[in-house]
Amino acid sequence: YDFTNCDFEKIKAAYLSTISKDLITYMSGTKSTEFNNTVSCSNRPHCLTEIQSLTFNPTAGCASLAKEMFAMKTKAALAIWCPGYSETQINATQAMKKARKSKVTTNKCLEQVSQLQGLWRRFNRPLLKQQ
């Protein structure tokens, strides 16, 4: 999906209002310095591409993020403010069904959500030069 035509300001507002709080809740009890940010993004469409991938695509050691509260609200925000997004997800979701059976918070998942927090922070500061 091409995130170029999304309403970035509304997605940012939704993130600041509630999605960010849900990410913090998920990470509660974890030190902010515990994980290094290894995933980066260069502009807002790129950030949303990476956020979408890390949130909804199962990875080795962490198959369960798509059922978390922050993921449900992320999906809602992208569907509402990115034209045509929800229609593109039909096939992708069917492929993920089997990977979502169990909901277990692993260290790998915590690391992945830490990466997500970094991507969202970058999304919110699009004018900053890439380090």
Partner: antibody, heavy 122, light 108 residues
Framework: QVQLVQSGAEVKKPGASVKVSCKSS????????MNWVRQAPGQGLEWMGQ????????TYNGNFKGRVTMTRDTSTSTVYMELSSLRSEDTAVYYC???????????????WGQGTTVTVSS | EIVMTQSPATLSVSPGERATLSCSVS???????LHWYQQKPGQSPRPWIF???NLASGIPARFSGSGSGTEFTLTISSLQSEDFAVYYC?????????FGGGTKVEIK
């Protein structure tokens, strides 16, 4: 304007199933999660689960132990809630409720259907 | 499961008086995830307050909400006849979503 119109009242026998519909209009149906909430007579509100019409993704309340199934028909902008193995305690008003971001970008159930009364009696 | 406990179950108040409704949450949640709904007999619930303190569209300013963590409050500064109803708090912090048992505000 956003409207959620639910199917009519149902009377069922214990052990049977019921399927309630909720037809949406006035917004992009595929882009908003739809919740089902029930209310037993004189009681409070109980969340049953939700469905994302865009891809059929669902999240259910475990209290219903596999008895509830939510589906959607994008061609008619309608979501369905089916409850099986009915018992008398399932007698309630069943509501569909859209969830979305309000003007302050808080996420909540912003529009509700008129409710469908389901009576379970032998 | 997060348990929402509302008190009192029934609040008897005279028109013009102040009403304070409480919602206690079994584990701490973000204030952005606490909402209030109003329901009148024979009607569907209506969104009333979003994110602890933000009034839904068209809700009069005599209503206010406050709180954080595990304790939240809905206050009606001067009750009008149309305010007599049941008010429910609800959390959107974790699954399953849960509601409080409701507080019925009735005429004294």
């Amino acid at each position: 304007q956003v409207q959620l119109v639910q199917s009519g009242a149902e009377v069922k026998k214990p052990g049977a199933s019921v399927k309630v519909s909720c037809k949406s209009s006035g917004y992009a149906f595929s882009s908003y999660w739809m919740n089902w909430v029930r209310q037993a007579p004189g009681q409070g509100l109980e969340w049953m689960g939700q469905i994302f019409p865009g891809d059929g993704d669902t999240t259910y309340n475990g209290n219903f132990k596999g008895r509830v199934t939510m589906t959607r028909d994008t061609s008619t902008s309608t979501v369905y809630m089916e409850l099986s193995s009915l018992r008398s305690e399932d007698t309630a008003v069943y509501y569909c409720a859209r969830s979305g971001f309000d003007y302050g970008y808080f996420y909540a159930m912003d529009y509700w259907g008129q409710g469908t009364t389901v009576t379970v009696s032998s | 499961e997060i348990v929402m406990t509302q008190s009192p179950a029934t609040l008897s108040v005279s028109p013009g008086e102040r009403a304070t409704l409480s919602c206690s949450v079994s584990s701490s949640i973000s204030s952005s995830n606490l909402h209030w709904y109003q329901q009148k007999p024979g009607q569907s619930p209506r969104p009333w307050i979003f994110g602890t303190s933000n009034l839904a569209s068209g809700i009069p300013a005599r209503f206010s909400g406050s709180g954080s963590g595990t304790e939240f409050t809905l206050t009606i500064s001067s009750l009008q006849s149309e305010d007599f109803a049941v008010y429910y708090c609800q959390q959107w912090s974790s699954y399953p979503l849960t509601f409080g048992g409701g507080t019925k505000v009735e005429i004294k």
